[in-house]
């Protein structure tokens, strides 16, 4: 339930990075509808050092009915996972003999959760149980962040998370699968 | 950093109402239930009910509502619960707490301090 | 509504013991968690849906259960493990707590 089915959109979206110019103005406007066509570049771009249409970052776009128990919401949500590695194509490891392999010991941009938004939602209960409301915890958007290796390990695998999740490792019963555990699937496969 | 920081210890005398806040930090109390609970001297957790802040609907354990009312403050972040017709059934500590969802699981991982209430004459 | 039962009530145990306290629930739920609480403090969230351990809880703790039985182990107690724990379901309303096990050690 929940994941069994689900629809998935990818937006390539432009980091908000001081230290690199705006994306223009129309790729600005549209990003959430942008289907990762030219690697969410404009067409025709070229290449330069310092363009931030060299970096990108991935919204994949899932709708998901979310749970709890036996319970399971009435309509499905819509949310966000942040995939990718963020950084100039051309030194990504997917862009070999395009140009160098990222340095360990340098910055590493990494695609993580941005702003969140609360949505409440109506939960339908088998058995005559009362409908539920809960509200869930859902990413509006993903942005680049700049890391160095000094940063705890952890925090590049689980952007966002509060103090009292549950810890890693340590997973749920596999009756459901939470939003979080598909999202480390997704950022772990890139 | 999340917190739910509680009002102090109150002394009220029978048959009086008091009022408890709990004021969040770190969140926006809009995006999440507050619920209420109540822990008599040495004995166990009591749920009373949660609201939601952003459109101050309520839900009650079946013996607390005539006793208990909740309301919410979203400018200063803040959550509160009455309680009226005070008896000493009534003396015990009370805390907020959040309620957090994740789409598969709903648990409580941040309270208040507590803050205790004391009826007597 | 559902009610929690938690079994024993008080537990005297030495250090580097192993302890499992259990919770039955008078009708099927869904998953459990469970609270530390030790005196003048407010509950801590301890385990997460049955086997999840809350952030900073030791890895000596445990959770396990399903349906109608759940139960809390400590793989060998430390005196710091001092406290009530407490059950909690909302798989059916109103949410409920189970009274506790307070754990001491000798």
């Known amino acids: 339930q929940g994941w069994q089915a689900f629809k998935n959109d990818a937006t390539e979206i432009i980091p908000e990075l001081g230290e690199y110019p705006e994306p223009p103005p129309e790729l600005e406007n549209n990003k959430t509808m942008n289907r990762a066509e030219n690697g969410g570049r404009p067409p025709h771009h070229p290449f330069e050092t310092k363009d931030v249409s060299e970096y990108s970052c991935r919204e994949l776009h899932f709708t998901r009915y979310v749970t709890d128990g036996p319970c399971r919401s009435a309509k499905p949500v819509t949310e966000l996972v942040c995939s990718g590695q963020c950084g100039p194509a051309r030194l990504l490891p997917n862009a070999i003999g395009r140009g160098k392999w990222w340095r360990p010991s340098g910055p590493d941009f990494r695609c993580i959760p941005d702003r969140y938004r609360a949505q409440r939602v109506q939960l339908l209960c088998p058995g005559g149980e009362a409908p539920r409301a809960r509200k869930v915890r859902l990413v509006a958007s993903c942005k680049c962040k700049r890391l160095t290796r000094f940063h705890n390990q952890s925090e590049l695998k689980d952007f966002g998370t509060e103090a009292a999740r549950p810890q890693k490792g340590r997973k749920p019963r596999p009756r459901a699968r939470s939003a979080k555990a598909n999202q480390a699937e997704l950022e772990n496969a890139y | 950093e999340v917190q739910l920081q509680q009002s102090g210890a109150d002394l009220v005398q029978p048959g009086a109402s008091v009022k408890v806040s709990c004021t969040a930090s770190g969140f926006d109390i809009k995006d999440y239930y507050i619920h209420w609970m109540k822990q008599r001297p040495d004995q166990g957790l009591e749920w009373i009910g949660r609201v939601d802040p952003d459109n101050g609907e309520t839900e009650f354990a079946p013996k607390f509502p005539g006793k208990a009312t909740f309301t919410t403050d979203t400018s200063s972040n803040t959550a509160y619960l009455q309680l009226r017709g005070l008896t000493s059934e009534d003396t015990a500590i009370y805390y907020c707490g959040r309620e957090d969802y994740d789409g598969t699981y709903t648990w409580f991982p941040y309270w208040g301090q507590g803050t205790l209430v004391t009826v007597s004459a | 509504q559902i009610v929690l039962s938690q079994s024993p009530a008080f537990l005297s145990v030495s250090p580097g013991d192993k302890v499992t306290m259990t919770c039955r629930a008078s009708?099927?739920?869904?998953?459990i968690h469970w609270f530390q609480q030790k005196p003048g403090s407010s509950p801590r969230s301890w385990i997460y849906a049955t086997s999840n351990l809350a952030s900073g809880v030791p890895g000596r703790f445990s959770g396990s259960g399903s349906g109608t039985s759940y139960s809390l182990t400590i793989s060998r107690v430390e005196a710091e493990d001092a406290a009530t724990y407490y059950c909690q379901q909302w798989s059916s309303d109103p949410l409920t707590f189970g009274a506790g096990t307070k754990l001491e050690l000798k």
């Open positions: 009708s099927s739920i869904s998953y």
